[in-house]
């Protein structure tokens, strides 16, 4: 069962896996959640009654029964991992810890104006896990305003001590705030010849890459496939690092694949969720249980529901044995990966889906797209919402996109003349406007947040957030779209679609069925040529056919320009403005969302 509250002055007895240092009990709980085996923890807070060497210790624990005996101890705070919970989990930690020095390998020292600047420097440095910043009140003159970037093998401090006039904090890479490049390519027949920090077994290069992504020290990897000549190294995933952050040597070797950590794009790509099945493959590990199951899908469900299960192997039933049920072997290991992978034995293996909740919901695969046609089908664009105004009468006002369970991203120009959020209604999961009746459920709007630099659509900053009064329960017909990664600024999107209920021509009416159009992106230079009277800034993005014919139009405003990249849909643009609709050599102009990621995160993650 899911227990989120912390138990004060309580210590769990036994079950120790390892001890790490964390600045708070809250962060200890996060570390426990992300550890492959931890189910419970005990944290020691600073206290005069405690030995200072034990302050800030976070003892990660495991138990077959999923609980441990409780003992009263002053300054101890205990709790359970969020593995047992169904809610979305994030490792993002924006807290700043005053008068704490988080110890690690100090590899870079520079002057910074503020702790925030120091944190940004850490976030944009490939090696940095956390930082300590000496404030201008720090006693040592030469250390005042010094920003120390730090890393450790585990990603957590090796020790935490009290130190007056300093502040410490963590890198915000896991908050999607890094400007580091996001390199998704996997390079076939390539070995990166740099130092290995760890090695695990993996069924394919994609799983290897995901493991690298959530390993604190891994910057890139090499994977030896099952056809690799050296048998003892088959399915071996080597996690690697280098001082420069890039591979120093690439060696051409057949049957090996290499790639990079997806740390800078992990909010828009699944990194914990290994959802594939591996046929004719057996995963070896510590056996947790053997149960009968009808299929490998059923076996995966059993593994997902057993909190300690990390991976499984399913052996299909022999002919009519056991009512057609096969054997489902639920397994675990110290690091969450199989200890060995065997092929040719007829098993079907896979991983628990319990960790999928650690990935952003927006990365979930949606229904295959319907090719051709202009009318959408239900569930094709599950992030698309219709924003209605009820004054003077109810009507469709603008489009918008679900980007979080309480957040809609849309255009600022939609709110011209809108005096209060009370007159707004957000409808999600809608295909036809005619579905909206008096009793159709909707989301009320609690707050309209318009970019404070917005004046008019043509001059940019045409972006707004709607905070909903209640949260959206994600289903197949209503779920979020991923924001583009800041590290993806150089990606060339080739599969982009504009959607909305807007006019189909300049003098028209709102459409009943959600319309879709595939539209190519246009470079800003090209776009500027088409709009000589306007300034096309880097905060805008243009799309359209040279000959016209397909475009967004009145009523589509605020809706998404959605682009598919590496199987994940990204909200690349917000429909903003254009000269007429679908006119020749007049592309549509959209708000370039990647340039506003910081603004969006600042507003949506504000306490």
């Amino acid at each position: 069962e899911c227990v989120t509250q912390l138990l004060k002055d309580t210590c769990f007895e036994g079950g120790d896996i390892t001890t790490v240092f964390t600045p708070s009990a809250k962060y200890c709980q996060v570390v426990c959640t992300y550890h492959p085996r931890c189910l419970l923890f005990t944290f020691t807070a600073e206290s005069p009654s405690e030995d200072p060497t034990r302050w800030f210790t976070c003892v990660l624990k495991d138990s077959v029964t999923e609980t441990l005996p409780r003992v009263n101890r002053t300054a101890a705070i205990s709790g359970y991992s969020f593995k047992q919970c169904s809610h979305q989990i994030s490792a993002c930690n924006k807290d700043i810890y005053v008068d704490l020095d988080m110890k690690g390998i100090n590899y870079n020292s520079s002057v910074a104006k503020s702790a925030q600047e120091c944190q940004e420097r850490c976030t944009d440095d490939v090696h940095c896990h956390f930082f300590t910043y000496a404030t201008r009140q720090f006693p040592s003159l030469e250390h005042r305003n010094i920003c120390l970037l730090k890393h450790t093998q585990t990603g957590t401090p090796t020790r935490i001590t009290k130190l007056d006039k300093v502040v410490s904090g963590f890198s915000l890479k896991s908050c999607a705030l890094s400007n580091l490049a996001c390199i998704r390519d996997i390079f076939p027949n390539t070995v990166f010849a740099d130092s290995n920090i760890d090695s695990v077994m993996a069924p394919d290069a994609f799983v290897c890459g995901r493991i690298c992504t959530h390993h604190p020290g891994c910057l890139f990897f090499t994977f030896f496939s099952q056809e690799w000549p050296k048998e003892s190294q088959r399915n071996l995933c080597l996690l690697k690092t280098s001082e420069s952050g890039l591979p120093s040597t690439r060696i051409k070797k057949s049957k090996a694949l290499s790639g990079f950590s997806l740390q800078s794009c992990r909010h828009s790509i699944p990194v914990f969720c290994h959802s594939s099945f591996y046929h004719d493959t057996d995963f070896l590990g510590e056996e947790l249980d053997i149960v009968a199951a009808k299929s490998h899908e059923a076996c995966q469900k059993l593994c997902t529901n057993a909190v300690r299960c990390q991976f499984f192997t399913y052996t299909p039933a022999q002919a009519s044995c056991n009512e057609g049920k096969g054997k489902c072997y639920l397994k675990l290991s110290s690091n969450g990966s199989p200890t060995k992978i065997l092929h040719g034995r007829g098993g079907i293996s896979g991983y628990t889906l319990r960790l999928c909740k650690m990935d952003n919901e927006c990365t979930t695969k949606i229904k295959p797209r319907i090719v051709g046609g202009t009318a959408s089908v239900r569930g094709e664009w599950p992030w698309q919402v219709t924003l209605h105004t009820t004054s003077p009468t109810q009507r469709h006002l603008c489009g918008g996109s679900i980007i979080g369970n309480q957040w809609i991203l849309t255009a600022a120009h939609c709110f011209y003349g809108v005096e209060s959020p009370k007159i707004l209604r957000v409808y999600s999961g809608i295909l036809n406007q005619s579905e909206i009746k008096e009793d159709t459920s909707f989301f009320g709007v609690q707050e309209i947040i318009i970019h404070d630099q917005y004046k008019m659509a043509e001059s940019g900053y045409d972006i707004a957030l709607l905070k909903l009064e209640t949260t959206v329960n994600y289903t197949d017909s209503q779920r979020p779209i991923c924001l583009p990664s800041k590290g993806d600024r150089n990606v060339i999107y080739t599969d982009c679609w504009v959607t909305g209920w807007g006019y189909r021509k300049l003098r028209d009416k709102i459409q009943n069925t959600l319309q879709k159009a595939k539209i190519p992106l246009v470079t800003n230079e090209e776009c500027q040529k088409r709009y000589r009277g306007h300034k096309i800034t880097h905060k805008m993005i243009c799309a359209g056919y040279r000959e016209g014919g397909k475009d967004a139009c009145k009523g589509d405003s605020g809706g998404p320009l959605s682009c598919k990249h590496n199987e994940v849909w990204h909200l690349v643009g917000i429909t903003s403005w254009g000269e007429g609709c679908a006119q020749r050599e007049r592309p549509g102009v959209y708000t370039n969302v990647v340039e506003y990621v910081d603004w969006i995160l600042e507003k949506t993650q504000a306490v």
């Epitope: 020292s109 003159l141 250390h143």
Partner: antibody, heavy 124, light 107 residues
Framework: QVQLVQSGAEVKKPGASVKVSCKAS????????MHWVRQAPGQGLEWMGI????????SYAQKFQGRVTMTRDTSTSTVYMELSSLRSEDTAVYYC?????????????????WGQGTTVTVSS | EIVMTQSPATLSVSPGERATLSCRAS??????LAWYQQKPGQAPRLLIY???TRATGIPARFSGSGSGTEFTLTISSLQSEDFAVYYC?????????FGGGTKVEIK
């Protein structure tokens, strides 16, 4: 062992510039700050400025602002101090001295390693 | 800037005797003070930092005390190699400033 070796003595005319070098060895050059201190004949010590060899940031005493430039070359672990528009009162022994270890935060320190000094004579 | 004043300017002491040197700051420098020894024709040598911590390799006869604006360097039993000029220096604010020095000479 840890040492700072400075360039040789210089004789300059008023209005000219002088560039003194200080080569560090025996420690990680970029991890410590470097100060420049001078001493006129028969006088006390006078602090001129500081450089952080890691990023190259500098801070100068007001008295020398606009006349002094401190630079570093990390490839040779050398810091340089250039003083321009020389006048006779700039005749002194110029020292480089290692300052705080910048990769650790601690409260107190001093200039623990000094160069042998470079005599600069300004005379017409 | 912070002005550091040392007294006396010259101190005449016999070998084996105790020497007490004073340093006053024009405003508080907390414990951000260092003491140096300089012999003729040589570079200064760090003796004390943080007002009272002996630098590596400095004999125990050298000790520092004080905080705020008043500081003292004490040499408990003067040896022949201790006759030199002693400077105090504040590390509390830019620009760093030195005292004028105290010359310890043989009586």
């Amino acid at each position: 062992q840890v040492q700072l070796v400075q360039s040789g003595a210089e004789v300059k005319k008023p209005g000219a510039s002088v560039k003194v070098s200080c080569k560090a060895s025996g420690y990680t050059f970029t991890s410590y700050s470097m100060h420049w201190v001078r001493q006129a004949p028969g006088q006390g010590l006078e602090w001129m400025g500081i450089i952080n060899p890691s990023g190259g940031s500098t801070s100068y005493a007001q008295k020398f602002q606009g006349r002094v430039t401190m630079t570093r070359d990390t490839s040779t672990s050398t810091v340089y101090m250039e003083l321009s528009s020389l006048r006779s009162e700039d005749t002194a022994v110029y020292y480089c001295a290692r300052g705080a270890y910048l990769l650790e935060l601690y409260y107190y320190y001093g200039m623990d390693v000094w160069g042998q000094g470079t005599t600069v004579t300004v005379s017409s | 800037e912070i002005v550091m004043t040392q007294s006396p300017a010259t101190l005449s002491v016999s070998p084996g005797e105790r020497a007490t040197l004073s340093c006053r700051a024009s405003q508080s420098v907390s414990s951000n003070l260092a003491w140096y020894q300089q012999k003729p024709g040589q570079a200064p040598r760090l003796l004390i930092y943080g007002a009272s911590t002996r630098a590596t390799g400095i004999p125990a006869r050298f000790s520092g005390s004080g905080s705020g604006t008043e500081f003292t360097l004490t040499i408990s039993s003067l040896q022949s190699e201790d006759f030199a000029v002693y400077y105090c220096q504040q590390f509390n604010d830019w620009p760093l400033t030195f005292g004028g020095g105290t010359k310890v000479e043989i009586k």
